[in-house]
Protein backbone atom coordinates (compact mmCIF):
# COMPACT_ATOMS: atom_id res chain seq x y z
CA UNK A 1 0.00 0.00 0.00
CA UNK A 2 1.43 3.39 -1.01
CA UNK A 3 1.09 6.18 1.51
CA UNK A 4 -1.12 9.13 0.53
CA UNK A 5 1.13 12.18 -0.07
CA UNK A 6 0.55 15.42 -1.96
CA UNK A 7 1.91 15.65 -5.50
CA UNK A 8 5.00 17.93 -5.71
CA UNK A 9 4.51 21.14 -7.62
CA UNK A 10 4.73 20.76 -11.40
CA UNK A 11 4.70 16.96 -11.29
CA UNK A 12 1.00 16.37 -11.90
CA UNK A 13 0.74 14.02 -14.88
CA UNK A 14 -1.27 15.44 -17.81
CA UNK A 15 -0.78 12.31 -19.88
CA UNK A 16 0.71 8.85 -19.57
CA UNK A 17 4.17 9.14 -21.08
CA UNK A 18 7.82 8.13 -20.63
CA UNK A 19 8.54 10.87 -18.14
CA UNK A 20 6.66 8.78 -15.57
CA UNK A 21 9.38 6.11 -15.44
CA UNK A 22 11.44 8.57 -13.39
CA UNK A 23 8.67 8.95 -10.80
CA UNK A 24 9.10 7.25 -7.48
CA UNK A 25 6.28 4.98 -6.36
CA UNK A 26 4.79 7.59 -4.05
CA UNK A 27 4.95 10.18 -6.81
CA UNK A 28 3.06 7.93 -9.20
CA UNK A 29 0.45 7.40 -6.53
CA UNK A 30 0.13 11.12 -5.83
CA UNK A 31 0.51 12.58 -9.31
CA UNK A 32 -1.22 10.18 -11.70
CA UNK A 33 -4.99 10.51 -11.86
CA UNK A 34 -6.68 7.10 -11.98
CA UNK A 35 -9.23 8.28 -14.53
CA UNK A 36 -6.43 9.55 -16.80
CA UNK A 37 -4.69 6.20 -16.44
CA UNK A 38 -7.89 4.36 -17.36
CA UNK A 39 -8.39 6.39 -20.54
CA UNK A 40 -4.75 6.07 -21.61
CA UNK A 41 -4.11 2.43 -20.67
CA UNK A 42 -2.99 1.70 -24.24
CA UNK A 43 0.12 3.84 -23.61
CA UNK A 44 1.29 1.93 -20.54
CA UNK A 45 2.71 -0.96 -22.53
CA UNK A 46 4.96 1.29 -24.56
CA UNK A 47 6.61 2.59 -21.40
CA UNK A 48 9.25 0.47 -19.55
CA UNK A 49 7.74 0.69 -16.08
CA UNK A 50 9.32 -1.40 -13.32
CA UNK A 51 7.29 -4.12 -11.60
CA UNK A 52 7.03 -1.87 -8.54
CA UNK A 53 5.66 0.99 -10.64
CA UNK A 54 3.13 -1.36 -12.28
CA UNK A 55 1.98 -2.33 -8.78
CA UNK A 56 1.17 1.33 -8.12
CA UNK A 57 -0.73 1.66 -11.40
CA UNK A 58 -2.73 -1.47 -10.61
CA UNK A 59 -3.51 -0.11 -7.17
CA UNK A 60 -4.89 3.10 -8.73
CA UNK A 61 -7.14 1.14 -11.08
CA UNK A 62 -8.32 -1.05 -8.20
CA UNK A 63 -9.36 2.07 -6.27
CA UNK A 64 -11.15 3.50 -9.29
CA UNK A 65 -12.95 0.26 -10.12
CA UNK A 66 -13.48 -1.69 -6.87
CA UNK A 67 -16.22 -3.80 -8.53
CA UNK A 68 -13.97 -4.82 -11.40
CA UNK A 69 -12.46 -3.07 -14.43
CA UNK A 70 -14.59 -2.17 -17.45
CA UNK A 71 -13.76 -3.94 -20.71
CA UNK A 72 -12.39 -0.72 -22.23
CA UNK A 73 -9.61 -0.85 -19.62
CA UNK A 74 -9.17 -4.63 -19.65
CA UNK A 75 -8.56 -4.67 -23.40
CA UNK A 76 -5.53 -2.39 -22.99
CA UNK A 77 -4.02 -3.87 -19.81
CA UNK A 78 -1.12 -5.47 -21.67
CA UNK A 79 1.64 -6.48 -19.28
CA UNK A 80 -0.35 -5.14 -16.36
CA UNK A 81 -2.50 -8.26 -16.83
CA UNK A 82 0.39 -10.30 -15.38
CA UNK A 83 -0.13 -8.40 -12.11
CA UNK A 84 -3.75 -9.47 -11.83
CA UNK A 85 -4.82 -12.23 -9.48
CA UNK A 86 -7.55 -14.78 -10.29
CA UNK A 87 -9.66 -12.96 -7.67
CA UNK A 88 -9.29 -9.67 -9.63
CA UNK A 89 -10.24 -11.39 -12.88
CA UNK A 90 -13.36 -12.99 -11.40
CA UNK A 91 -14.79 -9.47 -11.08
CA UNK A 92 -14.48 -8.83 -14.81
CA UNK A 93 -17.05 -9.22 -17.53
CA UNK A 94 -15.10 -9.92 -20.72
CA UNK A 95 -17.31 -10.31 -23.79
CA UNK A 96 -15.07 -9.30 -26.69
CA UNK A 97 -12.91 -11.90 -28.42
CA UNK A 98 -10.47 -9.09 -29.23
CA UNK A 99 -10.02 -8.42 -25.52
CA UNK A 100 -9.39 -12.10 -24.89
CA UNK A 101 -6.83 -12.26 -27.72
CA UNK A 102 -5.04 -9.16 -26.44
CA UNK A 103 -4.62 -10.66 -22.96
CA UNK A 104 -3.63 -14.11 -24.23
CA UNK A 105 -0.96 -12.43 -26.35
CA UNK A 106 0.63 -11.07 -23.16
CA UNK A 107 1.01 -14.61 -21.80
CA UNK A 108 2.04 -16.14 -25.15
CA UNK A 109 4.73 -18.79 -25.03
CA UNK A 110 4.11 -19.57 -21.36
CA UNK A 111 2.05 -22.34 -19.82
CA UNK A 112 -1.52 -21.51 -18.94
CA UNK A 113 -1.36 -19.54 -15.68
CA UNK A 114 -4.16 -19.50 -13.07
CA UNK A 115 -4.92 -15.94 -14.27
CA UNK A 116 -5.34 -17.07 -17.88
CA UNK A 117 -7.42 -20.08 -16.82
CA UNK A 118 -9.72 -17.78 -14.84
CA UNK A 119 -9.97 -15.31 -17.73
CA UNK A 120 -10.91 -18.06 -20.19
CA UNK A 121 -13.42 -19.51 -17.74
CA UNK A 122 -15.07 -16.09 -17.28
CA UNK A 123 -15.15 -15.50 -21.04
CA UNK A 124 -16.60 -18.89 -21.96
CA UNK A 125 -19.19 -18.78 -19.17
CA UNK A 126 -20.18 -15.30 -20.33
CA UNK A 127 -20.77 -16.59 -23.85
CA UNK A 128 -22.68 -19.62 -22.62
CA UNK A 129 -20.86 -22.03 -24.93
CA UNK A 130 -17.52 -22.61 -26.56
CA UNK A 131 -18.20 -21.29 -30.06
CA UNK A 132 -15.97 -21.90 -33.07
CA UNK A 133 -14.21 -18.51 -33.04
CA UNK A 134 -13.39 -18.81 -29.33
CA UNK A 135 -12.15 -22.37 -29.74
CA UNK A 136 -10.05 -21.30 -32.74
CA UNK A 137 -8.45 -18.58 -30.64
CA UNK A 138 -7.88 -20.68 -27.54
CA UNK A 139 -6.37 -23.67 -29.33
CA UNK A 140 -4.10 -21.35 -31.33
CA UNK A 141 -2.61 -20.07 -28.05
CA UNK A 142 -2.93 -23.33 -26.10
CA UNK A 143 -3.09 -26.49 -28.24
CA UNK A 144 -3.90 -28.52 -25.12
CA UNK A 145 -6.79 -26.27 -24.10
CA UNK A 146 -9.60 -28.57 -25.18
CA UNK A 147 -8.15 -31.48 -23.20
CA UNK A 148 -7.85 -29.31 -20.09
CA UNK A 149 -11.65 -29.10 -19.91
CA UNK A 150 -13.72 -31.54 -17.89
CA UNK A 151 -16.23 -33.78 -19.71
CA UNK A 152 -18.96 -31.59 -18.22
CA UNK A 153 -17.40 -28.44 -19.68
CA UNK A 154 -16.89 -30.13 -23.03
CA UNK A 155 -20.58 -30.91 -23.20
CA UNK A 156 -21.18 -27.20 -23.84
CA UNK A 157 -19.13 -27.33 -27.06
CA UNK A 158 -21.56 -27.13 -30.00
CA UNK A 159 -20.92 -29.56 -32.88
CA UNK A 160 -20.26 -26.61 -35.20
CA UNK A 161 -17.17 -25.71 -33.13
CA UNK A 162 -15.62 -29.11 -33.81
CA UNK A 163 -14.54 -27.83 -37.24
CA UNK A 164 -11.97 -25.66 -35.44
CA UNK A 165 -10.31 -28.65 -33.75
CA UNK A 166 -6.98 -29.86 -35.14
CA UNK A 167 -5.59 -33.36 -34.46
CA UNK A 168 -2.88 -31.98 -32.17
CA UNK A 169 -5.54 -30.30 -30.03
CA UNK A 170 -6.69 -33.78 -28.94
CA UNK A 171 -3.26 -35.23 -28.15
CA UNK A 172 -3.67 -35.06 -24.38
CA UNK A 173 -7.39 -35.88 -24.18
CA UNK A 174 -8.32 -38.89 -22.07
CA UNK A 175 -11.03 -41.45 -22.91
CA UNK A 176 -13.78 -39.65 -20.96
CA UNK A 177 -13.15 -36.44 -22.89
CA UNK A 178 -13.18 -38.23 -26.24
CA UNK A 179 -16.43 -39.96 -25.23
CA UNK A 180 -17.99 -36.48 -25.12
CA UNK A 181 -16.29 -35.08 -28.23
CA UNK A 182 -16.78 -38.03 -30.58
CA UNK A 183 -20.59 -37.79 -30.93
CA UNK A 184 -20.23 -34.06 -31.60
CA UNK A 185 -17.63 -34.72 -34.30
CA UNK A 186 -19.81 -37.42 -35.83
CA UNK A 187 -22.65 -34.92 -36.04
CA UNK A 188 -20.44 -32.13 -37.37
CA UNK A 189 -18.95 -34.25 -40.17
CA UNK A 190 -22.02 -36.34 -41.02
CA UNK A 191 -22.53 -34.85 -44.48
CA UNK A 192 -19.02 -35.58 -45.71
CA UNK A 193 -18.25 -38.49 -48.04
CA UNK A 194 -16.45 -41.64 -46.87
CA UNK A 195 -12.77 -40.84 -47.27
CA UNK A 196 -13.11 -37.15 -46.31
CA UNK A 197 -15.22 -38.13 -43.30
CA UNK A 198 -12.57 -40.56 -42.08
CA UNK A 199 -9.81 -37.95 -42.35
CA UNK A 200 -11.83 -35.58 -40.14
CA UNK A 201 -13.21 -38.11 -37.64
CA UNK A 202 -9.94 -40.01 -37.18
CA UNK A 203 -8.64 -37.86 -34.31
CA UNK A 204 -11.89 -38.36 -32.38
CA UNK A 205 -12.17 -42.13 -32.76
CA UNK A 206 -10.93 -42.72 -29.21
CA UNK A 207 -14.55 -42.12 -28.27
CA UNK A 208 -16.14 -44.32 -30.95
CA UNK A 209 -18.38 -47.28 -30.02
CA UNK A 210 -18.04 -50.77 -31.53
CA UNK A 211 -20.87 -50.33 -34.04
CA UNK A 212 -19.17 -47.28 -35.58
CA UNK A 213 -15.88 -49.18 -35.88
CA UNK A 214 -17.71 -52.06 -37.55
CA UNK A 215 -19.26 -49.59 -40.00
CA UNK A 216 -15.85 -48.06 -40.74
CA UNK A 217 -14.43 -51.52 -41.41
CA UNK A 218 -16.80 -51.77 -44.38
CA UNK A 219 -15.44 -48.57 -45.95
CA UNK A 220 -11.82 -49.44 -46.82
CA UNK A 221 -10.48 -46.72 -44.54
CA UNK A 222 -7.02 -48.28 -43.85
CA UNK A 223 -6.77 -47.03 -40.29
CA UNK A 224 -3.18 -46.63 -39.10
CA UNK A 225 -1.95 -48.42 -35.99
CA UNK A 226 -1.49 -45.20 -34.01
CA UNK A 227 -5.22 -44.50 -34.36
CA UNK A 228 -6.16 -48.12 -33.64
CA UNK A 229 -4.10 -48.05 -30.42
CA UNK A 230 -6.13 -45.06 -29.18
CA UNK A 231 -9.49 -46.79 -29.63
CA UNK A 232 -11.56 -47.67 -26.56
CA UNK A 233 -10.73 -51.15 -25.30
CA UNK A 234 -14.42 -51.99 -24.86
CA UNK A 235 -15.07 -50.90 -28.46
CA UNK A 236 -12.25 -53.04 -29.89
CA UNK A 237 -12.90 -56.27 -27.99
CA UNK A 238 -16.08 -57.31 -29.86
CA UNK A 239 -14.49 -56.84 -33.30
CA UNK A 240 -13.82 -60.03 -35.24
CA UNK A 241 -10.48 -60.81 -36.86
CA UNK A 242 -12.08 -60.17 -40.27
CA UNK A 243 -13.36 -56.75 -39.14
CA UNK A 244 -9.99 -55.69 -37.74
CA UNK A 245 -8.32 -56.86 -40.94
CA UNK A 246 -10.71 -54.73 -43.01
CA UNK A 247 -10.40 -51.77 -40.66
CA UNK A 248 -6.61 -51.71 -40.79
CA UNK A 249 -6.16 -52.81 -44.38
CA UNK A 250 -2.43 -52.92 -45.21
CA UNK A 251 -1.63 -51.70 -41.68
CA UNK A 252 -2.81 -55.00 -40.17
CA UNK A 253 0.80 -56.21 -40.13
CA UNK A 254 1.48 -53.62 -37.44
CA UNK A 255 -0.52 -55.70 -34.94
CA UNK A 256 2.52 -57.92 -34.41
CA UNK A 257 4.60 -55.04 -33.07
CA UNK A 258 1.78 -54.06 -30.71
CA UNK A 259 0.78 -57.53 -29.49
CA UNK A 260 1.94 -56.84 -25.92
CA UNK A 261 0.12 -53.52 -25.72
CA UNK A 262 -3.46 -52.57 -24.96
CA UNK A 263 -5.95 -52.73 -26.60
CA UNK A 264 -4.32 -55.16 -29.08
CA UNK A 265 -3.28 -57.57 -26.33
CA UNK A 266 -6.81 -57.82 -24.91
CA UNK A 267 -8.30 -58.23 -28.37
CA UNK A 268 -5.86 -61.04 -29.28
CA UNK A 269 -6.73 -62.95 -26.09
CA UNK A 270 -10.39 -63.02 -27.07
CA UNK A 271 -9.89 -64.41 -30.58
CA UNK A 272 -9.90 -68.04 -31.68
CA UNK A 273 -6.40 -69.14 -32.59
CA UNK A 274 -7.65 -70.41 -35.96
CA UNK A 275 -8.94 -66.92 -36.80
CA UNK A 276 -5.71 -65.24 -35.71
CA UNK A 277 -3.73 -67.65 -37.86
CA UNK A 278 -5.54 -66.37 -40.97
CA UNK A 279 -3.63 -63.09 -40.54
CA UNK A 280 -0.32 -64.91 -40.92
CA UNK A 281 1.34 -62.72 -38.30
CA UNK A 282 2.16 -65.35 -35.69
CA UNK A 283 -0.17 -63.81 -33.10
CA UNK A 284 -0.77 -66.10 -30.10
CA UNK A 285 -4.10 -65.95 -28.25
Amino acid sequence: EVEKTACPSGKKAREIDESLIFYKKWELEACVDAALLATQMDRVNAIPFTYEQLDVLKHKLDELYPQGYPESVIQHLGYLFLKMSPEDIRKWNVTSLETLKALLEVNKGHEMSPQVATLIDRFVKGRGQLDKDTLDTLTAFYPGYLCSLSPEELSSVPPSSIWAVRPQDLDTCDPRQLDVLYPKARLAFQNMNGSEYFVKIQSFLGGAPTEDLKALSQQNVSMDLATFMKLRTDAVLPLTVAEVQKLLGPHVEGLKAEERHRPVRDWILRQRQDDLDTLGLGLQG
Epitope: D174, P175, R176, M229, K230, T233, D234, L237, R260, H261, R262, R265, D266, L269, R270, Q284, G285
Partner: antibody, heavy 119, light 107 residues
Amino acid sequence: QVQLQESGPGLVKPSETLSLTCTVSGGSVSSRDDLWSWIRQPPGKGLEWIGYIYYSGSTNYNPSLKSRVTISVDTSKNQFSLKLSSVTAADTAVYYCARDFVLSGFDIWGQGTMVTVSS
Amino acid sequence: DIQMTQSPSSLSASVGDRVTITCRASQSISSYLNWYQQKPGKAPKLLIYAASSLQSGVPSRFSGSGSGTDFTLTISSLQPEDFATYYCQQSYDASYTFGGGTKVEIK
Protein backbone atom coordinates in the same frame (compact mmCIF):
# COMPACT_ATOMS: atom_id res chain seq x y z
CA GLN B 1 -20.08 -60.01 -5.63
CA VAL B 2 -16.73 -61.53 -6.63
CA GLN B 3 -14.37 -62.38 -3.77
CA LEU B 4 -10.84 -63.80 -3.81
CA GLN B 5 -9.14 -65.87 -1.16
CA GLU B 6 -5.45 -66.88 -1.10
CA SER B 7 -4.33 -70.10 0.54
CA GLY B 8 -1.04 -71.91 0.99
CA PRO B 9 1.86 -72.37 3.43
CA GLY B 10 3.11 -69.33 5.28
CA LEU B 11 6.65 -70.68 5.59
CA VAL B 12 8.84 -72.01 2.79
CA LYS B 13 12.46 -73.13 2.96
CA PRO B 14 15.10 -71.49 0.77
CA SER B 15 15.60 -73.20 -2.64
CA GLU B 16 12.14 -74.81 -2.41
CA THR B 17 9.00 -73.94 -4.39
CA LEU B 18 6.38 -71.55 -3.06
CA SER B 19 2.84 -72.67 -3.97
CA LEU B 20 -0.29 -70.59 -3.49
CA THR B 21 -3.88 -70.95 -4.68
CA CYS B 22 -6.53 -68.27 -5.16
CA THR B 23 -10.17 -69.33 -4.96
CA VAL B 24 -12.71 -67.21 -6.81
CA SER B 25 -16.22 -67.03 -5.34
CA GLY B 26 -19.26 -65.10 -6.54
CA GLY B 27 -17.95 -65.08 -10.09
CA SER B 28 -16.24 -67.24 -12.69
CA VAL B 29 -12.57 -67.64 -13.45
CA SER B 30 -13.74 -68.30 -17.02
CA SER B 31 -14.99 -64.74 -17.53
CA ARG B 32 -13.89 -63.35 -20.89
CA ASP B 33 -13.41 -59.89 -19.40
CA ASP B 34 -10.97 -60.79 -16.64
CA LEU B 35 -7.30 -61.58 -16.22
CA TRP B 36 -6.21 -63.16 -12.94
CA SER B 37 -3.03 -61.82 -11.40
CA TRP B 38 -0.59 -62.43 -8.60
CA ILE B 39 1.05 -59.42 -6.95
CA ARG B 40 3.44 -59.34 -4.02
CA GLN B 41 4.67 -56.81 -1.48
CA PRO B 42 7.85 -57.34 0.57
CA PRO B 43 7.62 -55.97 4.15
CA GLY B 44 7.78 -52.17 4.13
CA LYS B 45 8.17 -52.02 0.35
CA GLY B 46 6.06 -51.34 -2.73
CA LEU B 47 3.92 -53.55 -4.96
CA GLU B 48 5.39 -55.91 -7.54
CA TRP B 49 3.30 -57.60 -10.21
CA ILE B 50 4.22 -61.27 -10.68
CA GLY B 51 2.05 -62.34 -13.61
CA TYR B 52 -1.44 -63.05 -14.92
CA ILE B 53 -3.43 -65.84 -16.53
CA TYR B 54 -6.51 -65.82 -18.79
CA TYR B 55 -9.12 -68.55 -18.55
CA SER B 56 -7.83 -69.98 -21.85
CA GLY B 57 -4.49 -70.66 -20.18
CA SER B 58 -2.61 -67.75 -21.78
CA THR B 59 -0.10 -66.34 -19.31
CA ASN B 60 2.21 -63.40 -18.99
CA TYR B 61 4.94 -62.97 -16.39
CA ASN B 62 7.13 -60.27 -14.93
CA PRO B 63 10.40 -60.57 -16.92
CA SER B 64 12.46 -60.42 -13.71
CA LEU B 65 10.66 -63.51 -12.32
CA LYS B 66 9.78 -65.32 -15.54
CA SER B 67 12.31 -68.13 -15.20
CA ARG B 68 10.92 -69.13 -11.80
CA VAL B 69 7.17 -68.50 -12.14
CA THR B 70 4.29 -70.68 -13.28
CA ILE B 71 0.67 -69.58 -13.06
CA SER B 72 -2.07 -72.07 -13.87
CA VAL B 73 -5.87 -72.07 -13.88
CA ASP B 74 -8.36 -74.76 -12.90
CA THR B 75 -11.75 -73.75 -14.29
CA SER B 76 -13.49 -76.74 -12.73
CA LYS B 77 -12.48 -75.62 -9.22
CA ASN B 78 -12.74 -71.89 -10.06
CA GLN B 79 -9.17 -71.40 -8.91
CA PHE B 80 -5.84 -70.16 -10.20
CA SER B 81 -2.44 -70.93 -8.70
CA LEU B 82 1.08 -69.59 -8.37
CA LYS B 83 4.29 -71.55 -8.21
CA LEU B 84 7.59 -69.76 -7.57
CA SER B 85 10.65 -71.98 -7.61
CA SER B 86 14.11 -71.66 -6.03
CA VAL B 87 12.96 -69.14 -3.46
CA THR B 88 15.30 -67.02 -1.35
CA ALA B 89 14.76 -64.64 1.58
CA ALA B 90 14.15 -61.88 -1.02
CA ASP B 91 10.87 -63.64 -1.91
CA THR B 92 9.48 -63.04 1.58
CA ALA B 93 6.37 -60.92 1.05
CA VAL B 94 2.63 -60.61 1.32
CA TYR B 95 1.22 -62.32 -1.78
CA TYR B 96 -2.05 -61.04 -3.21
CA CYS B 97 -4.25 -62.49 -5.91
CA ALA B 98 -6.29 -59.94 -7.85
CA ARG B 99 -8.79 -59.66 -10.65
CA ASP B 100 -7.70 -57.45 -13.54
CA PHE B 101 -10.94 -56.36 -15.15
CA VAL B 102 -10.00 -55.49 -18.72
CA LEU B 103 -11.84 -52.16 -18.69
CA SER B 104 -10.44 -50.91 -15.39
CA GLY B 105 -7.62 -52.39 -13.35
CA PHE B 106 -7.08 -54.56 -10.29
CA ASP B 107 -10.58 -53.93 -8.97
CA ILE B 108 -10.85 -56.93 -6.63
CA TRP B 109 -8.07 -58.20 -4.35
CA GLY B 110 -7.66 -61.06 -1.93
CA GLN B 111 -6.79 -60.06 1.61
CA GLY B 112 -3.21 -61.23 1.08
CA THR B 113 -1.17 -64.02 2.63
CA MET B 114 2.22 -63.58 4.25
CA VAL B 115 4.87 -65.98 3.01
CA THR B 116 8.20 -66.14 4.81
CA VAL B 117 11.23 -67.82 3.26
CA SER B 118 13.41 -69.14 6.03
CA SER B 119 15.17 -72.31 7.03
CA ASP C 1 9.95 -52.70 -18.89
CA ILE C 2 8.13 -49.42 -18.53
CA GLN C 3 9.35 -47.59 -15.42
CA MET C 4 6.82 -45.68 -13.33
CA THR C 5 8.20 -42.83 -11.23
CA GLN C 6 6.02 -41.35 -8.51
CA SER C 7 6.61 -38.07 -6.72
CA PRO C 8 6.81 -37.14 -3.99
CA SER C 9 7.67 -40.36 -2.15
CA SER C 10 6.00 -38.92 0.93
CA LEU C 11 4.16 -35.79 1.94
CA SER C 12 2.62 -34.27 5.05
CA ALA C 13 -0.75 -32.58 4.80
CA SER C 14 -3.66 -31.46 6.92
CA VAL C 15 -7.33 -32.36 6.75
CA GLY C 16 -8.96 -30.12 4.13
CA ASP C 17 -5.77 -29.68 2.09
CA ARG C 18 -5.66 -30.20 -1.66
CA VAL C 19 -3.12 -32.92 -2.40
CA THR C 20 -1.52 -33.70 -5.75
CA ILE C 21 0.58 -36.78 -6.55
CA THR C 22 2.30 -37.21 -9.90
CA CYS C 23 3.31 -40.30 -11.82
CA ARG C 24 5.58 -40.35 -14.85
CA ALA C 25 5.99 -43.26 -17.28
CA SER C 26 9.32 -43.89 -19.01
CA GLN C 27 7.43 -44.09 -22.32
CA SER C 28 3.91 -43.31 -23.53
CA ILE C 29 1.25 -45.53 -21.99
CA SER C 30 -1.73 -43.75 -23.60
CA SER C 31 -4.38 -43.59 -20.83
CA TYR C 32 -3.72 -47.05 -19.34
CA LEU C 33 -2.89 -45.77 -15.88
CA ASN C 34 -4.55 -46.79 -12.61
CA TRP C 35 -4.30 -45.39 -9.09
CA TYR C 36 -4.59 -47.40 -5.84
CA GLN C 37 -4.86 -46.55 -2.17
CA GLN C 38 -3.36 -48.85 0.46
CA LYS C 39 -3.71 -48.66 4.21
CA PRO C 40 -1.39 -50.56 6.59
CA GLY C 41 -2.16 -54.28 6.76
CA LYS C 42 -4.79 -54.05 4.01
CA ALA C 43 -4.94 -54.92 0.32
CA PRO C 44 -4.75 -52.02 -2.13
CA LYS C 45 -8.01 -50.48 -3.34
CA LEU C 46 -8.60 -49.25 -6.90
CA LEU C 47 -9.43 -45.52 -6.98
CA ILE C 48 -9.00 -44.38 -10.58
CA TYR C 49 -8.72 -46.37 -13.79
CA ALA C 50 -7.95 -45.35 -17.37
CA ALA C 51 -6.20 -42.23 -16.02
CA SER C 52 -9.35 -40.32 -15.11
CA SER C 53 -12.31 -42.63 -14.50
CA LEU C 54 -13.50 -42.87 -10.91
CA GLN C 55 -14.00 -46.43 -9.69
CA SER C 56 -17.51 -47.14 -8.40
CA GLY C 57 -17.92 -46.27 -4.72
CA VAL C 58 -14.86 -43.99 -4.57
CA PRO C 59 -15.57 -40.44 -3.24
CA SER C 60 -15.60 -37.67 -5.85
CA ARG C 61 -12.85 -35.76 -4.04
CA PHE C 62 -10.47 -38.14 -5.82
CA SER C 63 -9.71 -37.31 -9.44
CA GLY C 64 -7.13 -38.32 -11.99
CA SER C 65 -5.80 -36.67 -15.12
CA GLY C 66 -3.10 -37.08 -17.73
CA SER C 67 -2.27 -39.01 -20.86
CA GLY C 68 0.90 -40.26 -22.51
CA THR C 69 3.66 -40.08 -19.90
CA ASP C 70 2.48 -37.63 -17.23
CA PHE C 71 -0.35 -38.32 -14.81
CA THR C 72 -1.78 -36.75 -11.68
CA LEU C 73 -3.91 -37.95 -8.77
CA THR C 74 -5.64 -35.13 -6.91
CA ILE C 75 -7.47 -35.25 -3.60
CA SER C 76 -9.47 -32.01 -3.55
CA SER C 77 -10.03 -31.89 0.20
CA LEU C 78 -8.09 -34.39 2.28
CA GLN C 79 -10.18 -36.36 4.79
CA PRO C 80 -8.91 -38.26 7.88
CA GLU C 81 -9.51 -41.60 6.12
CA ASP C 82 -7.32 -40.57 3.16
CA PHE C 83 -4.03 -40.87 5.05
CA ALA C 84 -2.50 -43.87 3.29
CA THR C 85 -0.01 -44.87 0.60
CA TYR C 86 -0.94 -44.30 -3.04
CA TYR C 87 0.39 -46.25 -6.03
CA CYS C 88 0.10 -45.71 -9.76
CA GLN C 89 0.22 -48.68 -12.15
CA GLN C 90 0.47 -48.96 -15.92
CA SER C 91 -1.41 -51.68 -17.78
CA TYR C 92 -0.52 -50.60 -21.32
CA ASP C 93 2.39 -53.00 -21.65
CA ALA C 94 1.87 -56.69 -20.85
CA SER C 95 4.53 -56.41 -18.13
CA TYR C 96 2.56 -54.39 -15.61
CA THR C 97 4.55 -52.05 -13.40
CA PHE C 98 3.75 -50.01 -10.29
CA GLY C 99 5.15 -46.71 -9.12
CA GLY C 100 7.16 -46.68 -5.90
CA GLY C 101 4.30 -45.25 -3.87
CA THR C 102 3.52 -41.95 -2.14
CA LYS C 103 2.85 -41.98 1.58
CA VAL C 104 0.41 -39.27 2.68
CA GLU C 105 0.93 -38.50 6.36
CA ILE C 106 -0.76 -36.17 8.85
CA LYS C 107 1.02 -32.86 9.31
